[in-house]
Interface confidence: low
């Protein structure tokens, strides 16, 4: 079934900032995406095309994106009578037309809404559930329940607290499947709640734009410390592991660290790429760390190799790779890292969003799909890593509805799916692993 | 090193089924797509589509969608590739070759089976 | 599909001569084109990937160029291994598709 209308407008994300919203007609009725939107992003990412107008949404309004795809998309898809189950080529066809490397004439924002819609759409015309259309679409004959990562402390750039660090993150692994794993995040994060309560009082529990809590601490341990504490009094340090995304381009200061970044500098105080490694290898020891993203500067790759070569745990690159292929595959070749987070608006379509996952996992990568911290109630990523086969979201804390709305999404799925059901559990790095 | 190691050569009658074998060694297996690619005799390559065994997922060319299957044996590091309802114009060197580190790049390829279809 | 086009379909070159093939997609593939070298009764070998890169253990004296739908592959100085034919072949997303190949003959 070809596409009869597009129309694309502009909403609000979870952060309040304008952002892209795509309703496409089919004959068998409207399929409507929104198109997240990153606090911080990837220098090497596709753009997203903001109209810097300051006298409007203090520059960051989208009507310019809307505009691309109301004038130049949406006529050229309709005329051309694709059927929506052909992904590859009308995604082709838009990043073709644009025809810059990244997406900077359209913007990824306009690409994306409308191919997401597409998506959307196509499973409809062939009568399947969404996470099916994408698992045929990669090329999967199976689907899989992921292990929800929730952000549940809050540091970095974004957070107001001295913490370096920007996100630690509760894995559930020795959940038996994807409802059980929401219970035990659910209770750890009001256990984590309390804890934080009675350390730093009650402001200290007020939420980050992901759901997380951002108490006033300076300690990236103290975070793990924290996070062992409330997994204790929840009842399940023999079922949940802790992640965490450094984001270290974010204290990268001339080839070494600054843990201290929130601070007035002092270039005495800053570590090596090798010290900031044997940090990372102590919490490992100490603490049940099994995930760390972004360890190190997004072009300091001989700290990212020699890093991967030695811990035995899953290193994620989110900055590096910026869920590029080209940014890939140097990675896959240098052994950087061994797992990719997917951000479908970092490369701006879901095609190429298939085919990074594909290239990561081809090269037994493991993949970790992601939400951005401007989210909206759209649910298409809880589609995504089930289709995908990941075994592994991130899409914030439980708490605050445009995260709930992936966690929601996919207790339905795996509702769906009954008996069929297969949670990735304890294999959430390789979750088809024969 | 790398190495693809096919299986035989193989006559066949026409409407019968090959079934072609490749097994691989030097790498772990589970980390490269494999693809199949034939070439009939004096010309060119045609790409047949790919199976990645560490999914088992697979993509065909619309072309032999239908005909073909492609699976792997990851115990033995081994993927075959089986054609059905053979025509004299099947008649070809099937390669399975190795994807490298970006994706539609082979950089391994195996020594080639000949597949002829003749009554 | 995306068609390729291969020219010339064969040349004849002499030892040390510099050589230029062509390569034309039907529409813009960027930089995702793929070179190969095939020699009678033997599999192809890759020559050059991502339309410019060599990979370990090509010689220098091969090399590729172009992005969207025109390439080009240049061998600077011929020898003697170099005689066979030639295959592009893009990757930008299924089904790959090969050119018809360029026959390089000793003159």
């Known amino acids: 079934m070809s596409i009869l209308k597009i129309h694309a407008r502009e909403i609000f994300d979870s952060r309040g900032n304008p952002t892209v919203e795509v309703d496409l007609f089919t004959s068998k009725g409207l399929f409507r995406a929104a198109v997240p939107s990153g606090a911080s992003t990837g220098i090497y990412e596709a753009l997203e095309l903001r109209d810097n107008d300051k006298t409007r949404y203090m520059g960051k309004g989208v009507s310019k994106a809307v505009e691309h795809i109301n004038k130049t998309i949406a006529p050229a898809l309709v005329s051309k009578k694709l059927n929506v189950t052909e992904q590859e080529k009308i995604d082709k066809l838009m990043i073709e037309m644009d025809g810059t490397e990244n997406k900077s004439k359209f913007g990824a924002n306009a690409i994306l809404g409308v191919s997401l819609a597409v998506c959307k759409a196509g499973a409809v015309e062939k009568g399947v559930p969404l996470y099916r259309h994408i698992a045929d679409l990669a090329g999967n004959s199976e689907v899989i329940l992921p292990v929800p990562a929730f952000n549940v402390i809050n540091g970095g750039s974004h957070a107001g607290n001295k913490l370096a660090m920007q996100e630690f993150m509760i894995l559930p692994v020795g959940a038996a499947n994807f409802r059980e794993a929401m219970r035990i995040g659910a209770e750890v994060y009001h256990n984590l709640k309390n804890v934080i309560k009675e350390k730093y009082g009650k402001d200290a529990t007020n939420v980050g734009d992901e759901g997380g809590f951002a108490p006033n601490i300076l300690e990236n341990k103290e975070g793990l410390e924290l996070l062992k504490t409330a997994i204790g009094k929840a009842g399940y340090t023999d079922k949940v592991v802790i992640g965490m995304d450094v984001a270290a381009s974010e204290f990268f200061r001339s080839g070494k660290y600054d843990l201290d970044f929130k601070s007035p500098d002092d270039p005495s105080r800053y570590i090596s790429p090798d010290q900031l490694a044997d940090l990372y290898k102590s919490f490992i020891k100490d603490y049940p760390v099994v995930s760390i993203e972004d360890p190190f500067d997004q072009d300091d790759w001989g700290a990212w190799q020699k890093f991967t070569a030695s811990a035995a745990i899953q290193v994620v690159g989110d900055d590096l790779t910026v869920t590029n292929p080209k940014r890939i595959a140097k990675a896959v070749n240098e052994k950087s890292c061994n797992c990719l987070l997917l951000k479908v608006n970092q490369i701006g379509s879901v095609t190429e969003s298939l085919q990074a996952c594909k290239l990561a996992q081809a090269n037994g990568w493991g993949v970790m799909v992601s939400h951005r911290s401007g989210e909206t109630e759209d649910t298409f990523i809880a589609d995504l890593v089930v289709g995908l086969c990941t075994g592994q979201i991130k899409t914030g804390a439980p708490c605050r509805s445009e995260r709930l709305a992936k966690y929601n999404q996919l207790l339905r799925i795996e509702e769906e799916l009954g008996s069929k059901a297969k949670f990735a559990g304890r294999n959430f790095r390789n979750p088809l692993a024969k | 090193q790398v190495q693809l190691v096919q299986s035989g050569a193989e006559v066949k009658k026409p409407g019968a089924s090959v079934k072609v074998s490749c097994k691989a060694s030097g790498y772990t297996f589970t980390s490269s797509v494999m693809n199949w690619v034939r070439q009939a005799p004096g010309q060119g390559l045609e790409w047949m589509g790919y199976i990645n065994p560490y999914n088992d997922g697979t993509k065909y060319n619309e072309k032999f969608k239908g005909r073909v299957t492609m699976t792997t044996d990851t115990s033995t590091s081994t993927a075959y590739m089986e054609l059905r309802s053979l025509r004299s114009d099947d008649t070809a060197v099937y390669y399975c070759?190795?994807?490298?580190?970006?994706?539609?790049?082979?950089?391994?390829w195996g020594q080639g089976t000949l597949v002829t279809v003749s009554s | 599909d995306i068609q390729m086009t291969q020219s010339p379909s064969s040349l004849s070159a002499s030892v040390g001569d510099r050589v230029t093939i062509t390569c034309r997609a039907s529409e813009n593939i960027y930089s995702y084109l793929t070179w190969y070298q095939q020699k009678p009764g033997k599999a192809p070998k890759l020559l050059i990937y991502?339309?410019?890169t060599l990979p370990e253990g090509v010689p220098s004296r091969f090399s590729g160029s172009g992005s969207g739908t025109d390439f080009t592959l240049t061998i600077s100085s011929l020898q003697p291994e170099d005689f066979a034919t030639y295959y592009c072949q893009h990757h930008y997303g299924t089904p790959y598709t090969f050119g018809q190949g360029t026959k390089l003959e000793i003159k």
């Open positions: 070759a190795r994807e490298g580190f970006y994706y539609g790049n082979f950089d391994n």
């Open positions: 991502n339309a410019k």
